[in-house]
C-alpha cells in the first residue's frame, strides 16, 4: 500500500482542516488508514483522524483544531496499521479556505432597490471576521447569459442594487462566497442560493 498523491490540506481558520490524498489503489480509508496530527506546541496532544473514502482510491480527513492562529504548525503522520506511509507538516494559516457565508436573504420591499444580506461565517473574535470580502453571483433562471458577479470589497455583508438593473417579471437566483486577502486565501464555497421574483414599476415616460 502506497500513497500516490500526498495529502494536501486546507483550513477554515476556525475549527476544521480538511486533508485529501490518493492511494495507489482502491482503499477502504476508514478501516485501513489513520491520520495522526499534533500541534507543534508545548503540552499539545496527538489526535487521530479517521479518513473517509473520496472516490475509489481517494481519502479525505476532517481534522478538528482548537484556537487556530497564524503561528500554528502541525505534524501529520499517515499510518496503515503499524506502517508509516507518509510524514509531513501543515501550517493552517498558509492554506486557508474560508467558510461559506450563510443566511443569504433578498429584501425586495425597499423602493425599487434590491437589498441582499448574508451572515459573516466567523465569530467576532476570529481574525477573519473583519477581513472578509465577498463576491455575489446573480443569475436568471430563464436566461443563462444573464449572469453577473458583484464584488463586495467593504466589510458589511450586504449589497444594494437597483431592481431596474435586472429584468422585470422573471425569477433570479443569488449566491455569495468569501475570501480574505490578508491570508491570501482561496475562495470559499458558494453559499446556498436564494430565489426571488424580480418586479419593479417601469418609470413613467413623459
Amino acid at each position: 500500500m502506497k500513497v500516490l498523491q500526498e495529502p494536501t490540506c486546507v483550513s477554515d481558520y476556525m475549527s476544521i482542516s480538511t486533508c485529501e490524498w490518493k492511494m495507489n489503489g482502491p482503499t477502504n480509508c476508514s478501516t485501513e488508514l489513520r491520520l495522526l496530527y499534533q500541534l507543534v506546541f508545548l503540552l499539545s496532544e496527538a489526535h487521530t483522524c479517521i479518513p473517509e473514502n473520496n472516490g475509489g482510491a481517494g481519502c479525505v480527513c476532517h481534522l478538528l483544531m482548537d484556537d487556530v492562529v497564524s503561528a500554528d504548525n502541525y505534524t501529520l503522520d499517515l499510518w496503515a496499521g503499524q506502517q508509516l506511509l507518509w510524514k509531513g507538516s501543515f501550517k493552517p494559516s498558509e492554506h486557508v479556505k474560508p467558510r461559506a457565508p450563510g443566511n443569504l436573504t433578498v429584501h425586495t420591499n425597499v423602493s425599487d432597490t434590491l437589498l441582499l444580506t448574508w451572515s459573516n461565517p466567523y465569530p467576532p473574535d476570529n481574525y477573519l471576521y473583519n477581513h472578509l470580502t465577498y463576491a455575489v453571483n446573480i443569475w436568471s433562471e430563464n436566461d443563462p447569459a444573464d449572469f453577473r458577479i458583484y464584488n463586495v470589497t467593504y466589510l458589511e455583508p450586504s449589497l444594494r442594487i437597483a431592481a431596474s438593473t435586472l429584468k422585470s417579471g422573471i425569477s433570479y437566483r443569488a449566491r455569495v462566497r468569501a475570501w480574505a486577502q490578508c491570508y491570501n486565501t482561496t475562495w470559499s464555497e458558494w453559499s446556498p442560493s436564494t430565489k426571488w421574483h424580480n418586479s419593479y414599476r417601469e418609470p413613467f415616460e413623459q
Epitope: L42, L43, D66, D67, S70, A71
Partner: antibody, heavy 116, light 111 residues
Framework: QVQLVQSGAEVKKPGASVKVSCKAS????????MHWARQAPGQGLEWMGI????????SYAQKFQGRVTMTRDTSTSTVYMELSSLRSEDTAVYYC?????????WGKGTLVTVSS | QSVLTQPPSVSAAPGQKVTISCSGG????????VSWYQQLPGTAPKLLIY???KRPSGIPDRFSGSKSGTSATLAITGLQTGDEADYYC????????????FGTGTKLTVL
C-alpha cells in the same frame, strides 16, 4: 463574552501556601490554554507557567519549578495555581490569562500579600 | 530566562505619535511573533497587538505593531489622554525551554 473570574485577595505568612482560582466562562474551556503571570507592586509582568485544560498537562517557568502547581477542574471550568513556601518577594497580583502564544483575555487579578 | 528590553518611559502631547521599542534575542523575538499589552492604572493587562501587527476586534487602528529582526515596535498615533498606561511587549521562546517572557514595561505619559 469571555470572563475569567479570580478568587479574592489573600494574606499569608512566610512559608505558607496559597491557592488562587480562575473560573472561566463564555468559551469552550478545554479548547484554550491558560497562563499564569504575576506582577509585584510597581514592577513588570512575570510569566509563571501554562496549563492545557484538555489533558491537564503543565509547564512552569524555571524560576518557579518545585514551588508552583497548576491544576484544573473541567466540571467547573476552573483552573488553579498553588504557590508554596511563600516569601515576602511573592507579594504580587496573580493573573490567569487565556491564550496560546499570546494572552487574549486576562482575569482581574488576585492580590496575594505575604507578611509576617 | 529571556529578557525583552523596553524604554522605561515615553511621553508626548495629545494628538501626537509615539513609538515604544522592544528588543530581545534571536531565540525569542527573532524566532517568534510579538504581542503588546496595555495596562491602564489599577487594571489587568489587555491585549493590544498580536502576531506582530494584528489588532483584536475593538482595538482602534491608532495602535499598530511591527517587527524587524530581533526587535519590535508599538506605534500609537493621535494620542489621547486615555492612552496613558503601562505597555508591555511579549513573545515566546522555545529554546532551551518554552517560556513566555514579557518586556520590562514602558510608562506612557500624555502631556
Amino acid at each position: 463574552q469571555v470572563q475569567l473570574v479570580q478568587s479574592g485577595a489573600e494574606v499569608k505568612k512566610p512559608g505558607a501556601s496559597v491557592k488562587v482560582s480562575c473560573k472561566a466562562s463564555g468559551y469552550a474551556f478545554t479548547s484554550y490554554y491558560m497562563h499564569w503571570a504575576r506582577q509585584a507592586p510597581g514592577q513588570g509582568l512575570e510569566w509563571m507557567g501554562i496549563i492545557n485544560p484538555s489533558g491537564g498537562s503543565t509547564s512552569y517557568a524555571q524560576k518557579f519549578q518545585g514551588r508552583v502547581t497548576m491544576t484544573r477542574d473541567t466540571s467547573t471550568s476552573t483552573v488553579y495555581m498553588e504557590l508554596s513556601s511563600l516569601r515576602s518577594e511573592d507579594t504580587a497580583v496573580y493573573y490567569c490569562a487565556r491564550g496560546k502564544y499570546w494572552m487574549y483575555d486576562w482575569g482581574k487579578g488576585t492580590l496575594v500579600t505575604v507578611s509576617s | 530566562q529571556s529578557v525583552l528590553t523596553q524604554p522605561p518611559s515615553v511621553s508626548a502631547a495629545p494628538g501626537q505619535k509615539v513609538t515604544i521599542s522592544c528588543s530581545g534575542g534571536s531565540s525569542s523575538i527573532g524566532n517568534s511573533y510579538v504581542s503588546w499589552y496595555q495596562q491602564l492604572p489599577g487594571t489587568a493587562p489587555k491585549l493590544l497587538i498580536y502576531d506582530n501587527n494584528k489588532r483584536p476586534s475593538g482595538i482602534p487602528d491608532r495602535f499598530s505593531g511591527s517587527k524587524s529582526g530581533t526587535s519590535a515596535t508599538l506605534a500609537i498615533t493621535g494620542l489621547q489622554t486615555g492612552d496613558e498606561a503601562d505597555y508591555y511587549c511579549g513573545t515566546w521562546a522555545t529554546s532551551p525551554v518554552w517560556e513566555w517572557p514579557f518586556g520590562t514595561g514602558t510608562k506612557l505619559t500624555v502631556l
